[in-house]
Amino acid sequence: TPVVRKGRCSCISTNQGTIHLQSLKDLKQFAPSPSCEKIEIIATLKNGVQTCLNPDSADVKELIKKWEKQVSQKKKQKNGKKHQKKKVLKVRKSQRSRQKKTT
């Protein structure tokens, strides 16, 4: 159960069930800090529920890998779309310059 409070860790308990990648909206990992000396992982599900995950669990480690892979793939897709837009803009610019030259 995540409870964010001053000067203490956020996670009192961790989720008992298995969380599937499809139900994940966000996954945040918090590094150890002066207020909490351990790694904490807080998942936000698509239904809005937030829950703590056990960083020592093999299932959770696997979920993190899958999540990070999914995130990097989405970034690549976004970057790909940006490059495509830039190419289209370049084409349009070159067409305009050609039109000017021909007139």
């Epitope: 159960t1 409870v3 860790c9 308990s13 989720n15 351990k38 529920v49 056990n54």
Partner: antibody, heavy 121, light 109 residues
């Protein structure tokens, strides 16, 4: 089924020590934060202490800080409360309770039946 | 430390009546961190409401919670004989201690 069973209560003289135990079954103990809550005769509930699921973090009520120590053994599915320098005002029924692990909202969703501690000379 | 005040101290009602119990905090509590418990004589408390308004597993829908900030309410729409008990609110919303209110006793008129 999900169950918490406290033990270790009894009659003890002021200034002496006592250790309470709470045996958990029917759920993944190592995933759950655990609390001790007490209730003096004819009085309301008083939160005493909390330990995180992994035993790293402990929190105490001011009334017991420095005298009581909460601990757990996840390999034995057991929660403990070591009580030192006991006072007459520590006389109460002591309950262990599970912190609800399922989501963002908190609550103690499973309670033991309680064990009675009487501090008297 | 957040102090919780519950009112009234005792509520005398008949079965079938509506019960409205109040819990007031000395400073603002996130609604995510307020719970209600029921306790009958000789028994351990039982979680009724968490997150100010969500019913715990197996709790009948005649129990409902509401409120935010410093004012919270537990309502029992129609009292059943088994509902006569003491009710406690509890806050989780600040650093420990996770205080309980003093309780409201609902007894038979």
């Amino acid at each position: 089924q999900v169950q918490l069973v406290e033990s270790g209560g009894g009659v003890v003289q002021p200034g002496r020590s006592l250790r309470l135990s709470c045996a958990a079954s029917g759920f993944t103990f190592s995933n759950c934060g655990m609390h001790w809550v007490r209730q003096a005769p004819g009085k309301g509930l008083e939160w005493v202490a909390l330990i995180g699921y992994d035993g790293i973090n402990e929190y105490y009520a001011d009334s017991v800080k420095g005298r009581f120590t909460i601990s757990r053994d996840n390999s034995k599915n057991t929660l403990y409360l070591q009580m030192n320098s006991l006072r007459a005002e520590d006389t109460a029924v002591f309950y262990c309770a599970r912190d609800w692990p399922e989501g963002y909202y908190n609550g103690m969703d499973v309670w033991g039946q309680g064990t009675t501690v009487t501090v008297s000379s | 430390e957040i102090v919780l005040t519950q009112s009234p101290g005792t509520l005398s009602l008949s079965p079938g009546e509506r019960a409205t119990l109040s819990c007031r905090a000395s400073q603002s509590v996130s609604s995510s961190y307020l719970a209600w418990y029921q306790q009958k004589p000789g028994q351990a408390p039982r979680l009724l409401i968490y997150g100010a308004s969500s019913r715990a597993t197996g709790i009948p829908d005649r129990f409902s919670g509401s409120g935010s900030g410093t004012d919270f309410t537990l309502t029992i729409s129609r009292l059943e004989p088994e509902d006569f008990a003491v009710y406690y609110c509890q806050q989780y919303g600040s650093s420990p201690p996770f205080t309980f209110g003093p309780g409201t006793k609902v007894d038979i008129k």
